[in-house]
Amino acid sequence: DWVIPPISCPENEKGPFPKNLVQIKSNKDKEGKVFYSITGQGADTPPVGVFIIERETGWLKVTEPLDRERIATYTLFSHAVSSNGNAVEDPMEILITVTDQNDNKPEFTQEVFKGSVMEGALPGTSVMEVTATDADDDVNTYNAAIAYTILSQDPELPDKNMFTINRNTGVISVVTTGLDRESFPTYTLVVQAADLQGEGLSTTATAVITVTDTNDNPPIFNPTTYKGQVPENEANVVITTLKVTDADAPNTPAWEAVYTILNDDGGQFVVTTNPVNNDGILKTAKGLDFEAKQQYILHVAVTNVVPFEVSLTTSTATVTVDVLDVNEAPIFVPPEKRVEVSEDFGVGQEITSYTAQEPDTFMEQKITYRIWRDTANWLEINPDTGAISTRAELDREDFEHVKNSTYTALIIATDNGSPVATGTGTLLLILSDVNDNAPIPEPRTIFFCERNPKPQVINIIDADLPPNTSPFTAELTHGASANWTIQYNDPTQESIILKPKMALEVGDYKINLKLMDNQNKDQVTTLEVSVCDCEGAAGVCRKAQPVEAGLQI
């Protein structure tokens, strides 16, 4: 049987080497001489020769300093043979434990740790964690028991201990109030990790803490009073630029300004934010009227895109806006004037007076009137009074110039301001009808076939309006009824049917047709009738020689 005491060897031993560890014995040595040998890692396999054994005495020796952090345990096998070389024992496993010395200082996992914390954070708020490791034995010794401390803080303001570190975990927390990004945007901490629970080997690293922004600063007007002027009637005109400063982080929602006009019930102004420099650009939202109000005193408040994190006073500014008088065009009242007038209104008589009002009540101005559009040249205007008269006869049935019984003329009024301003009015003459048009047939040229002629419909047209139109009366005159007949085509008597009484020779005929409207205004019209060499409905007319004059009735 083997006699092997537990074997441990401290790392980093000084020597001299080789150094005795233990003496191995086999109790078979009582029966005869026993020779010892070892095999395994550190003996005959790499690292070879770290351990040796005296062949005859069994003293196990170490030949060099050990490094626990490289190899913490060696597994060897001891062998015992007699002088004839026969094994007297089965091989025995030997475990050599390398005991730890505190020969490794902690190492931080990073040289620089980065963290962030909101300004104004409450004490107790975790900021970041630093971590160090130690290669020494943390199971059986305190050689790797790391304790963390903060060695320094830069800046040491507003307190030299703004942060604290959990000595066991390396978690850095806020310990004091007063973190203010606008005063101290970053802190640099030198942190230490020391083993032996803080009493041993140590190393340092840097923790850089960025204080992040909250909206704890209001935008402030500088200056707080502004003056501007704007011409009347012009929308989207820049009046003035409002300046603000905000100590929060630029180009963030906590810095970006939002402007509100506190006393603009009419929505006449608007303030937009210049995204580059945060200026407020005050503009007109709609045209202002000098004659109604010459000056506005606006109160403008400024806040941020996001709400204030803390209770802050909202900054306000006063803007005095002077409205500048501009020469405005005269305004016709009404802008569109309707006048009913009979189409037989006497030439040279006054139809109506159409005048404009001068909006510039603070300027004494003279208005001059002119006709701008009068396509039929029927009208003239008194340049001083705006009285409109006829210069020619009106005609409701002049369909080139009159639409739906309405004749449209444009009148302009010009003041004598600087620069001159011109306003336009629309005059609508509603022409009432006079029975000045007799009925006429349509068509006036008619074709019949010589054989089996088809009766032809003739429409009766009157340019006038009822009651100066249908029902119409039709009558053949000058002997036409000898060869032709007419009859009404419909109850309104707005068309007639013409047909020959007998077979007619091919040729041209003239028929006198008298048409009379409902008010007995009549007119005789000559119809041009052609009889063609065909049958039924007249198509393309192939005429024979003209009919002799005697037949043309």
Epitope: M118, E119, G120, A121, L122, P123, G124, T125, S126, P158, D159, N161, T164, N166, R167, N168, T169, V171, S173, V175, T176, T177, G178, D180, T214, D216, E309, V310, S311
Partner: antibody, heavy 117, light 111 residues
């Protein structure tokens, strides 16, 4: 002299409301987090609420969350505790205290709040 | 149930020394050197007597001293006097909210 002075305590019925004030003097009030700590009769100290120096961050114990509101007016150097929906178990002496570095100091003299019908 | 554990009571005769313990965890007492002790006489507000384990504010007697080992802090009072009879509370900073933990209090009786 550094001093905190509470006011506003008294007797209130269950479900009622009360506002405590704490006037600070002798130190830069806006630089310090402030706390309310209460002590029920014959009991230990219980942390109730806290607020950062700027007033931007607040904390409430679970027992008062949703019922109590802490606020401060740095222009008046005053801390407030608005207590709504009061219960019998809210009966205690309420102290305001300033948080220095790692410790609560100074403390106010305390105000008794009694919730009883 | 308080976060930090203190004995409910201790007593001593005038002139003697006593120690009051305050036991927490590795996340509060054991993690930070921000342990404070407060003295409270009946009907009065707590008074700070030690901060940062062993720092005495001005005006506090040097008979009061503090120490810390691992997760336990201790308040020692030497040369006990009648006016030392009071309740004593420990507190510790901790990461998170609330950032202060209180002990349940210890009643000191001077016999």
């Amino acid at each position: 002299e550094v001093q905190l002075l509470e006011s506003g305590g008294g007797l209130v019925q269950p479900g009622g409301s009360l506002r405590l004030s704490c006037a600070a003097s002798g130190f830069t009030f806006s630089s310090y987090a402030m706390s309310w700590v209460r002590q029920a009769p014959g009991k230990g100290l219980e942390w109730v609420s806290a607020i950062s120096g700027s007033g931007g961050s607040t904390y409430y114990a679970d027992s008062v969350k949703g019922r109590f509101t802490i606020s401060r007016d740095n222009s008046k150097n005053t801390l407030y505790l608005q207590m709504n929906s009061l219960r019998a178990e809210d009966t205690a002496v309420y102290y305001c205290a300033s948080w220095g570095t790692g410790t609560l100091w100074p403390w106010g003299q305390g105000k008794m709040v009694t919730v009883s019908s | 149930q308080s976060a930090l554990t203190q004995p409910a009571s201790v007593s001593g005769s005038p002139g003697q020394s006593i120690t009051i313990s305050c036991t927490g965890t590795s996340n509060d007492v054991g993690a930070y050197n921000y342990v404070s002790w407060y003295q409270q006489h009946p009907g009065k507000a707590p008074k700070l007597i030690l901060s940062e384990v062993n720092k005495r504010p001005s005006g506090v007697s040097n008979r009061f001293s503090g120490s810390k080992s691992g997760n336990t802090a201790s308040l020692s009072i030497s040369g006990l006097q009648a006016e030392d009879e009071a309740d004593y509370y420990c507190s510790s900073f901790t990461s998170g909210l609330p950032w202060v933990l209180f002990g349940g209090g210890t009643k000191l009786t001077v016999l």
